[in-house]
Interface confidence: low
């Protein structure tokens, strides 16, 4: 369905409000350092232009592609060279190279100040004074810090953000109403950003086939009553949506996502019995609801997989004639029968099956060769099961904070070259798997835990890619998407690492730690723990525990002291000396 003017087409499909919001997100995700006012000006100019094209699709420049229009607009920014350095060179290129160039300069860890939440009254005043600007600023601040945030989903977050302020700014106790809602949005937003980052990494680093395999497995678990052809259609459409969003084509992405939600709801009888409630909601809520919908019940009469994929004499014939479709069917059939497996485990099983067929279909007796292929699955299934069992036991024994500390020590010893802030952030997130997944029954633990770990380890991979410091991290991140977690799990202490020089400044603390929130105080202590391990990678758990207990007691004591700063200075010196003695530094 070719349109004379793509910009007019998208403006009409999405409506002015969503059009403006999506263009703002796109621009903020590309030019992450630009001031808010500059972006608003660019968005308004694009919107006015779009309106002229709606009025007359034959008007000048209306036939240009969105990449051309948006790229031309971004390249008008006066301070591009000073602010972005070599990114300015993108503007010398033609489309589609120019857009690719902008994409390559997206920064997963931009040097931006931490978002500080103002007082509730200040926020409510700002909301009432200019609601539109207030909400645009939210989109801008999230988009520039999360350059791969799933744009149509960010519109859903903004809708909830607006609803929270609308309700709470007229409540008797504004803070009690608003702050929990904002905390929830922040935590959900970080999780949503990380999940989408994995989808984009999957598409960009491992290709469409890898993403489609992931989607076949996940959708087959979610919609086990849907036929293979139906799942294939959904996978094709979903791949298009995510390819567009990850490629910066946010208008097309949002439009296609809406179409996909519409299709799913119109055909829910042949997809899933769980979609009814979702499909009664407005568009943004509907799409979000479908993406999070629980797995449908498995059909009762599913035959054994062995008949088609092992016992049949035609396995190699079928495989040779349509490799990807045959493997897709295998994955579909296995996944719909195993909602208790993680997606990455299902993909490992499919890879093992593929490797076996590649080998056996060239053998003298193929059937004899692949007859025992399902036996090869057993150790692959047991490995994550055992790992989750052990770690959930450890989590239940230690609680979240100490479980995070155990992981901090474990991962710092594996990859000590990685920056301390990255190790702290990633290990804290790895540790959250306990609270998130260990409460679930056995049948839900693995999909919860291992697929969450894939998301967190991808954070490590994208942060490490920006400034690579460890060959081991690079190896685990690039060799196989589905084996990242087993690769990191298998890493032992890095014996080649030369311990970091001791620096007393790293372990010098001040009274400001006393005014920090519990979370911030934990991060300070965990930062110190990582530094300790970097100085003394061979320190035992017992040694590290003793030093950390002393450190906690020191902070508690000095925060209760009358002269806090003096206490931190004097007691801090004693603590450093005692720690050096305890660890033999």
């Amino acid at each position: 369905d070719a349109h004379k003017s793509e910009v007019a087409h998208r403006f009409k499909d999405l409506g002015e409000e969503n059009f403006k919001a999506l263009v703002l997100i796109a621009f903020a995700q590309y030019l992450q350092q630009c001031p808010f006012e500059d972006h608003v000006k660019l968005v308004n100019e694009v919107t006015e232009f779009a309106k002229t094209c709606v009025a007359d699709e034959s008007a000048e420049n209306c036939d240009k592609s969105l990449h051309t229009l948006f790229g031309d607009k971004l390249c008008t920014v006066a301070t591009l060279r000073e602010t972005y350095g070599e990114m300015a060179d993108c503007c010398a290129k033609q489309e589609p190279e120019r857009n690719e160039c902008f994409l390559q300069h997206k920064d997963d860890n931009p040097n931006l100040p931490r978002l500080v939440r103002p007082e509730v009254d200040v926020m409510c005043t700002a909301f009432h004074d200019n609601e539109e600007t207030f909400l645009k600023k939210y989109l801008y601040e999230i988009a520039r810090r999360h350059p791969y945030f799933y744009a149509p989903e960010l519109l859903f977050f903004a809708k909830r953000y607006k609803a929270a302020f609308t309700e709470c700014c007229q409540a008797a106790d504004k803070a009690a109403c608003l702050l929990p809602k904002l905390d929830e949005l922040r935590d959900e937003g970080k999780a949503s950003s990380a999940k989408q980052r994995l989808k984009c990494a999957s598409l960009q680093k491992f290709g469409e086939r890898a993403f489609k395999a992931w989607a076949v497995a996940r959708l087959s678990q979610r919609f086990p009553k849907a036929e293979f052809a139906e799942v294939s259609k959904l996978v094709t459409d979903l791949t298009k949506v995510h390819t567009e969003c990850c490629h910066g084509d946010l208008l097309e992405c949002a439009d296609d996502r809406a179409d996909l939600a519409k299709y799913i709801c119109e055909n829910q009888d042949s997809i899933s019995s769980k979609l009814k409630e979702c499909c009664e909601k407005p568009l943004l809520e509907k799409s979000h609801c479908i993406a999070e919908v629980e797995n449908d019940e498995m059909p009762a009469d599913l035959p054994s997989l062995a008949a088609d994929f092992v016992e049949s004499k035609d396995v190699c014939k079928n495989y040779a004639e349509a490799k990807d479709v045959f493997l897709g069917m295998f994955l579909y059939e296995y996944a719909r029968r195993h909602p208790d497996y993680s997606v990455v485990l299902l993909l490992r099983l499919a890879k093992t099956y593929e490797t076996t067929l590649e080998k056996c279909c060239a053998a003298a007796d193929p059937h004899e060769c692949y007859a025992k292929v399902f036996d090869e699955f057993k150790p692959l299934v047991e490995e994550p099961q055992n790992l989750i069992k052990q770690n959930c036991e450890l989590f239940e024994q230690l609680g979240e904070y100490k479980f995070q500390n155990a992981l901090l020590v474990r991962y710092t010893k594996k990859v000590p070259q990685v920056s301390t802030p990255t190790l702290v952030e990633v290990s804290r997130n790895l540790g959250k798997v306990g609270s998130k997944c260990c409460k679930h029954p056995e049948a839900k633990r693995m999909p919860c835990a291992e697929d969450y770990l894939s998301v967190v380890l991808n954070q490590l991979c994208v942060l490490h890619e920006k400034t690579p410091v460890s060959d081991r991290v690079t190896k685990c991140c690039t060799e196989s998407l589905v084996n990242r977690r087993p690769c990191f799990s298998a890493l032992e202490v890095d014996e080649t690492y030369v311990p970091k020089e001791f620096n007393a400044e790293t372990f010098t603390f001040h009274a400001d730690i006393c005014t920090l929130s519990e979370k911030e105080r934990q991060i300070k202590k965990q930062t110190a723990l990582v530094e300790l391990v970097k100085h003394k990678p061979k320190a035992t758990k017992e040694q590290l525990k003793a030093v950390m207990d002393d450190f906690a007691a020191f902070v508690e004591k000095c925060c209760k002291a009358d002269d806090k700063e003096t206490c931190f200075a004097e007691e801090g010196k004693k603590l450093v000396a005692a720690s050096q003695a305890a660890l033999g530094l």
Epitope: D314, E321, A322, V325, M329, Y332
Partner: nanobody, 115 residues
């Protein structure tokens, strides 16, 4: 996306004939072996017949041998099943599949053999 749409089913008397068609799209039909599968009420899926990608090699379940003929037209991306001498036990939903799978990839077409 992979799509298979069957047609040609209906109500027929014992001893009668029907010709089923399966229109394929979303994949390179000419590169794939295809099958017909059927599912009778309250029973599991039963493989009926298969044909290789070129149309030279055909196979049949014992229950239909000599009565059913599978064929294909790669130019039209269509699979056929000519069913003669139909019996009441042939009553089922018939659907086509890629390769030799008994997994339903489509809605199928109902065949009812009854006097």
């Amino acid at each position: 996306q992979v799509q298979l749409v069957e047609s040609g089913g209906g109500l027929v008397q014992p001893g009668g004939s029907l010709r089923l068609s399966c229109a394929a799209s979303g994949f390179s039909f000419g590169s794939f072996g295809m099958s017909w599968v059927r599912q009778a009420p309250g029973k599991g899926p039963e493989w009926v017949s298969a044909i290789d990608s070129g149309g030279a090699d055909t196979r049949y379940a014992e229950t239909v041998k000599g009565r059913f003929t599978i064929s294909r037209d790669n130019a039209k991306k269509t699979l056929y099943l000519q069913m003669n001498s139909l019996k009441p036990e042939d009553t089922a939903v018939y659907y086509c599949t890629i390769g030799r799978s008994t997994t339903r990839g489509s809605q199928g077409t109902q065949v009812t053999v009854s006097s």
